[in-house]
Amino acid sequence: MAVTACQGLGFVVSLIGIAGIIAATCMDQWSTQDLYNNPVTAVFNYQGLWRSCVRESSGFTECRGYFTLLGLPAMLQAVRALMIVGIVLGAIGLLVSIFALKCIRIGSMEDSAKANMTLTSGIMFIVSGLCAIAGVSVFANMLVTNFWMSTANMYTGMGGMVQTVQTRYTFGAALFVGWVAGGLTLIGGVMMCIACRGLAPEETNYKAVSYHASGHSVAYKPGGFKASTGFGSNTKNKKIYDGGARTEDEVQSYPSKHDYV
């Protein structure tokens, strides 16, 4: 029950996270106008990964794509790539995890197959979340670097002429959405990986009786009533008498119908 809950919760958390990554990637407010020294303005500027927008005080908004520009920096292209990779991996992870859900029965799919699929989707979610966090962080670093460089230019000037700055751009809502969404996807992925451990059937469940002398499991030995429980002087699983009991090595080599309880 706990495994199903962990898996289900992991799926839902990842689903919300990936939806957030998609939303952040599409949002225009990756960087917004910093109103420092400019509290009253009739124009509000903000930029996304794909286009720049201007909102007038009247409410009219106009946006322009970056395709008509002279050049896009490698950093922006890298951010775009990271976000898209995150979305693609997340989408595939969601698809895989749907079939891996314990509460959904598809044909005669074994638990081991579901466990493998759960682990695969979990890893995909983790990588997806990391991609989103990395992409958003790279963009944030670009803004921080520029913010301080432009601040420095306010005082030092450029080419011997004064370079003052009217507007600077700071973190937009999309950055916070991206960070939170990436974190949720990452958490969801970890939960799926944890759930995978509970789904995987332990092979030792079937062999523990005859292979291990430890514990309270008692194997029935034909020809006598004395059996080792793992306590006392017989912890090495030595021969007690020849009436049918065998050493651990012998049992492993020649299993009989009596070896499985």
Epitope: W30, S31, D34, N38, T41, A42, V43, N45, Q47, S52, V54, R64, Y66, T68, L69, L70, G71, L72, P73, M75, L76, F139, M142, L143, T145, N146, M149, S150, A152, N153, M158, Q163, V165, Q166, T167, R168, Y169
Partner: nanobody
Amino acid sequence: EVQLVESGGGSVQPGGSLSLSCAASGDTFRAKCMAWFRQGPGKEREVVATIQSGYYRPYYTDSVKGRFTISQDADKNRVYLQMDSLKPEDTAMYYCAADRFTYPPGVICGGISENYRYWGQGTRVTVSS
């Protein structure tokens, strides 16, 4: 709206220097991306340099890199183009242009002339011996 007025043009010998100035008036807060364009005789209008309000890295077309410097004084709503080591091929009508769009760091603002909403009347620069 934004009004742009250029000044500083004139005739100069090859290797000489000129400083162009562009004064913005009106709704100057709209002029986020400032640029200098030029149009030589019988040529297409081309971007020379661009600078974005709030971003420190200007853009220069390959033919003027190392020779021209664009800068702005936002307090006085002016943009400048310092032209050194002038060549005869720099002879053209120079236009100041402004755009109200801004872009993320590293993205070269402006680009094609169609992106600019506000234009000045231009100032002529002649480089000849």
